[in-house]
Amino acid sequence: MVADPPRDSKGLAAAEPTANGGLALASIEDQGAAAGGYCGSRDQVRRCLRANLLVLLTVVAVVAGVALGLGVSGAGGALALGPERLSAFVFPGELLLRLLRMIILPLVVCSLIGGAASLDPGALGRLGAWALLFFLVTTLLASALGVGLALALQPGAASAAINASVGAAGSAENAPSKEVLDSFLDLARNIFPSNLVSAAFRSYSTTYEERNITGTRVKVPVGQEVEGMNILGLVVFAIVFGVALRKLGPEGELLIRFFNSFNEATMVLVSWIMWYAPVGIMFLVAGKIVEMEDVGLLFARLGKYILCCLLGHAIHGLLVLPLIYFLFTRKNPYRFLWGIVTPLATAFGTSSSSATLPLMMKCVEENNGVAKHISRFILPIGATVNMDGAALFQCVAAVFIAQLSQQSLDFVKIITILVTATASSVGAAGIPAGGVLTLAIILEAVNLPVDHISLILAVDWLVDRSCTVLNVEGDALGAGLLQNYVDRTESRSTEPELIQVKSELPLDPLPVPTEEGNPLLKHYRGPAGDATVASEKESVM
């Protein structure tokens, strides 16, 4: 949903403070182009290119990354990259990942505290409930689509020949063996971290020890902290802490402003990182292709499985989600998607929803007119619990493995796969390759062999990227839908439901006709005096 930019009397778009403090004036045509409008004349083409420069650079980076990767791996000889050379080759990409991960912690915590504190409890509850309902429904739809596609295309039967090359002894050792109950208990434990500081870099996980108890070997569950941010725990804490701050009333306002300011500063850093994203993405994609030993052979053996996953992701991402968005908002979903191309490409490059979060926040706010307190409340939750891509892939993989090992799937098993995939995808929590771990839970739930998880792992580098793109797209469209819901409830009620706690100094408000902008965006007279500055907008990169 593209919010009309606030205009001055001359019909120009509002001047916006840039990251370096200057003002950027963008014409209405530029805004239209940026929002996915069509470019006609040469002048318009130039404007269009300028407005969409970052998007174009990102798309070019992905294509260039694929070309570079294929070129390097195809060249061989002097260009052949050993492990030590490969790590140097992907270094620019590693740098992007590090920058994004550096931003995640302050961004998630501050944005959620600020977001939860800026909404009145009733609105917060409603918003959260609608968000979770949207996430649940779309994940279930993705699961159903995955099962349906796999049953129709039969990727397992087509790929049965890979069994022969893999050999009878699969690699069950590679398959994580974890009780379904323990997986969900771990999820609950991570929601309530015992130590907030360690939650920033560690999560709780159950492993097993074999102990001799009265002459019998018994598998005993043992809890331990494992590397990896407990984003779920941080999200829950931040929301609860934000609600608590709001309860404090005036006493909590200073702290709310602190978190909002921290958030703004973080978003300025994000706007700088965004310009480095195309470089990083190019090397991440290229590096992954170089790393693969025989991509051609892999596609020949697992082509139908890959096709099934990617086709499912494409159908869900380009048809199902946009259709849901259109039905509820009556707005062009593809225009919305155009506004988030950069984070989608970043999701493809980094393969992590968490790492994409900073860019996604920036883009939905600046390109798609989603209010800050909505995007910064919904997106971190979405990045944690909304895993349409993962659920779809897990369902395809489960059916694929059933077909591969000639195991039947009755109605009860199919329902079990759908429910388990939907539930366990929540636990994947934005960690790269988390989906393969939860796949083992699904296979165990329907008594399917775990031997073939090694095959799934072989192409996970590609499928997981596609999953991540779909996951983050679902988050963004969810934020867009909720923005629309808020807009409608706002226009119906006289008293605004959502109260934004401002981090700026109070300035005299400049009245703006509601139809010209987003009713949630509050406008203030800019420092220049004549131009209006939308306080909800951050910087133009």
């Epitope: 069994n163 090992s405 000639q406």
Partner: antibody, heavy 120, light 107 residues
């Protein structure tokens, strides 16, 4: 009812080939995988591998790669085990067994067995 | 490969006796344990699959239990037709492996 009927006993010389058949009836042949199990004299049971009856793809156990070939003729619902260049240690009873389509790897119906004796 | 160890290797019992045969896996097989009965010169017959589920047509005097690595087959009251060799088999991962067998004889 489900039935697996195997071909009769074989007496072969070392180096010769042998082909054992297993005709299935009483169920949809291409729905269940077909496994082959060997039982050497006085020994236990050893899984040789299985064939994906829908895709027609064989999967061999580590000790049965090379001289052993699993094949199918779906038009007559029959699975075959062919052993080339027979050795004395191939003397055993060979069973075909239908692989269950549930609970991973177990065998719910077995053929009566085909005794292959390799002797010069 | 997962090793399956059956005990005892042979067992003498009388009609009406309650008999227990145990099977131990070299690693956790998560209940994917199956039991077969084989009579001399015949093919094995499935008795129990997935630790405790009775195959169709198998008398209810046969029962199975266990978890993790340790499993048991129990015959509550021996009948004349029960004297045979019993094999356990793990179906958790490829390749499926069998125990060496327990020969049940008349005392």
């Amino acid at each position: 009812q489900v039935q697996l009927v195997q071909s009769g006993s074989e007496l072969k010389k070392p180096g010769a080939p042998v082909k054992v058949s297993c005709k299935a009836s009483g169920y949809t042949f291409s729905t269940f995988g077909m496994s082959w199990v060997r039982q050497a004299p006085g020994q236990g049971l050893k899984w040789m591998g299985w064939i994906h009856t829908y895709a027609g793809v064989p999967i061999y156990g580590d000790d049965f790669k090379g001289r052993f070939v699993f094949s199918l003729d779906t038009s007559v619902s029959t699975a075959y085990l062919q052993i080339s260049s027979l050795k004395a240690e191939d003397t055993a009873v060979y069973f075909c067994a239908r692989r269950s389509d549930n609970y991973r790897y177990f065998f719910d119906y077995w053929g009566q067995g085909t005794t292959v004796t390799v002797s010069s | 490969d997962i090793q399956m160890t059956q005990s005892p290797s042979s067992l003498s019992a009388s009609l009406g006796d309650r008999v227990t045969i145990t099977c131990r896996a070299s690693q956790d097989i998560r209940n994917y344990l199956n039991w077969y009965q084989q009579k001399p010169g015949k093919a094995p017959k499935l008795l129990i699959y997935y630790t405790s589920r009775l195959h169709s047509g198998v008398p209810s005097r046969f029962s199975g239990s266990g978890s993790g690595t340790d499993y048991t087959l129990t015959i509550s009251s021996l009948q004349p037709e029960d004297f045979a060799t019993y094999f356990c088999q793990q179906g958790h991962t490829l390749p499926p492996t069998f125990g060496q067998g327990t020969k049940l004889e008349i005392k």
